[in-house]
């Protein structure tokens, strides 16, 4: 978002009217309330940066996203017998990277058309809701996900509802959460008609100077409560969790728990590497720079950090791939093109011929779900 | 060089309508806004309308409905009609360059055009 | 709307000397203000702007500074040609004027 500049005479409230349009002269629309944007902002708005570079990007991540995630939920949901805390908080992070992502074809389509919403004030507030209503979504589940991987190894025991139950219930109150944080993106008008580009920007352009300064403060907070601090337990879990794998005896089925907890860290790490540190870091220096100095000269690295943001949708399946035995099977299955009934018989007759040998690396068996390492 | 000349001087009788012109030259009217300043006798600068390079115009709220600014690309020229005159809108109207981004001035303008409204 | 008042109204100075002209802002502009000059008959004519951006064209004895709501045009050392009225634009949040500083020779 970068600071418009409001040339209304009269001023106006926190929800007015932008793009008011009052009659049209020769080729051109007479604009009763108009923003202007400095020279830097208006070559990121019409430059290659937002028209190619981002579509292309949601492109990917609508392309791999929305099939892995809608898998892994549907896994999750109807394949996983067992709904143990990991399964729960593994379904709610499919949930909202499905929930995000679904709007992105009206994402690229904006950007396509040179940073132009002509979809309603409505849809972009829910676009701008859900993308980082997403974002920080993932960050909590993700942390509870890690918190859970780490009470699993120091206390392996067997699962209950009590547990399932809590997992829930804190799934729930993170919904809530992210709902009532998100708020204040919903009421806030978010398109800008400017005049100068003759383009009607989704969230690019902050429509109120007053805003500028709750927009830090709440990106800030937003920053030290729903990244900084998760981002500080999700470590600390990581941390305890090597500790622990590194004191542990090492027989051969350890160590394939230890190398699939050790690609789990290495994904993690690069989910806030490349999408959450970034954007929450830039949305912080960016809303300040425009605070203080009523332009960001960053805007195009807040650009790029948020699009990056978004391949969390996409990063997020190898998690689920390296805990849920179900979703990798599925995925495995899906990839090969075959069916789980296949692999099934295929296993009961390899089982038979080696008689009782067990091969737990292959079990995908849905009443024997593990989804420990 | 880049250069704004404006119509003659206008006496005009009250409640009629009066169109300045403002013929650009050294730039392109596509790429560059036009802005209408005035100034009464006496007085300081007030701010009128503007229009982008793409057709786009906006106006001062004090001239709403009385102010239309418009652009022949072909002519290169900006005009500015103002109707209904009042004894109180005796001024120099100038008319000026602006790239049409925040972070540009009003670097160059016309020579003025006073216009007269008197019974 | 944001009002722009200036000061002093008349500023009486002698070539040579040094004139500080203000321009106060009722809420910040941050740095989108800029300076012109106007002599009597004349159009306005750009001399700084963005707050202290030095227009094309315009001699280095001329300078502006500040931000947010105070800002201020120096002229180093006057010439007989800079005696004229000198007003402040603001184009953060929409488009005023200052009233005018007029220098005049003492």
């Known amino acids: 978002t970068i600071q418009g500049t409001n040339r209304s005479s009269k001023g106006r409230s926190l929800i007015g009217k932008v793009d008011g349009t009052s009659h049209v002269t020769g080729k051109g629309v007479t604009v009763e309330t108009v923003f202007s944007v400095d020279e830097f902002s208006a070559s990121v708005l019409t430059g290659k940066l937002t028209t190619v570079f981002l579509p292309i990007v949601y492109t990917i991540v609508f392309v791999v996203g929305l099939p892995s995630n809608g898998m892994a939920l549907w896994v999750f949901l109807f394949r996983t017998k067992k709904k143990h805390p990991a399964v729960i908080y593994m379904a709610n992070l499919a949930l909202a990277d499905l929930l995000s992502v679904i709007w992105f074809p009206l994402k690229i389509a904006y950007h396509i058309h040179g940073n132009n919403w002509i979809y309603g004030e409505a849809l972009c507030n829910v676009l701008i809701g859900f993308f980082y209503g997403n974002m920080y979504c993932s960050i909590l589940f993700m942390t509870c996900l890690s918190v859970q991987r780490y009470w699993v190894i120091v206390n392996p025991m067997g699962h209950s509802r009590k547990k399932a139950n809590i997992a829930i219930g804190i799934s729930l109150a993170i919904w809530l959460l992210i709902l009532l944080v998100t708020i204040p993106l919903y009421v806030v008008k978010q398109t800008i008609f400017i005049p100068a580009l003759n383009i009607t920007t989704c969230h690019d352009v902050l429509p109120e100077q007053l805003l500028v300064g709750d927009m830090f403060n709440y990106f800030l907070s937003l920053a030290i409560g729903v990244f900084l601090f998760p981002a500080f337990l999700t470590a600390s879990a990581y941390v305890l969790m090597i500790r622990m794998l590194r004191s542990s005896a090492m027989d051969e089925n350890s160590e394939k728990k230890r190398k699939r907890a050790i690609k789990l860290i290495v994904t993690v790490l690069a989910m806030y590497l490349i999408c959450f540190t970034p954007s929450n870091l830039l949305l912080v220096v960016h809303y300040f720079l425009i605070k203080s100095q009523g332009q960001s000269h960053v805007y195009a690295l807040y650009i790029v950090a948020l699009c990056l943001s978004t391949l969390n949708s996409c990063i997020d399946p190898f998690v689920y791939y390296f805990v849920s035995h179900d979703f990798r099977d599925h995925a495995k299955n899906a990839l090969l093109c075959r069916s789980v009934r296949t692999v099934k018989q295929m296993q009961v007759s390899l089982t038979s011929k080696k008689h009782s040998r067990k091969s737990s690396s292959y079990s995908s068996s849905s009443t024997t779900v593990k989804t420990s390492y | 060089q880049v250069q704004l000349v404006q119509s003659g001087a206008e006496v005009k009788k009250p409640g009629s309508s009066v169109k300045v012109s403002c013929k650009a030259s050294?730039?392109?009217?596509?790429?560059?806004?036009v802005i209408w300043v005035r100034q009464a006798p006496g007085q300081g600068l007030e701010w009128m309308g503007v229009?982008?390079?793409?057709?786009?115009?906006y106006y001062a709220q004090k001239f709403q409905g009385r102010v239309t600014i418009t652009a022949d690309e072909s002519t290169s020229t900006a005009y500015m009609e103002l109707s209904s005159l009042r004894s109180e809108d005796t001024a120099v109207y100038y008319c000026?360059?602006?790239?049409?981004?925040?972070?540009?001035?009003?670097?160059?303008w016309g020579q003025g055009t006073l216009v007269t409204v008197s019974s | 709307e944001i009002v722009l008042t200036q000061s002093p109204a008349t500023l009486s100075l002698s070539p040579g000397e040094r004139a500080t002209l203000s321009c106060k802002a009722s809420q910040n502009v941050y740095k989108y203000l800029d300076w012109y000059q106007q002599k009597p008959g004349q159009a306005p004519r750009l001399l700084i702007y963005n707050t202290n951006s030095l227009a094309t064209g315009i001699p280095a004895r001329f300078s502006g500074s500040g931000s947010g709501r105070d800002f201020t045009l120096t002229i180093s050392s006057l010439e007989p040609e800079d005696f004229a009225v000198y007003y402040c634009?603001?184009?953060?949040?929409?488009?005023?004027f200052g009233g005018g500083t007029k220098v005049e020779i003492k």
């Open positions: 634009l603001q184009h953060n949040s929409g488009w005023t």
């Open positions: 050294g730039f392109s009217l596509s790429s560059y806004g």
């Open positions: 229009i982008w390079g793409n057709g786009n115009t």
């Open positions: 000026a360059r602006w790239r049409g981004y925040k972070d540009y001035p009003f670097d160059y």
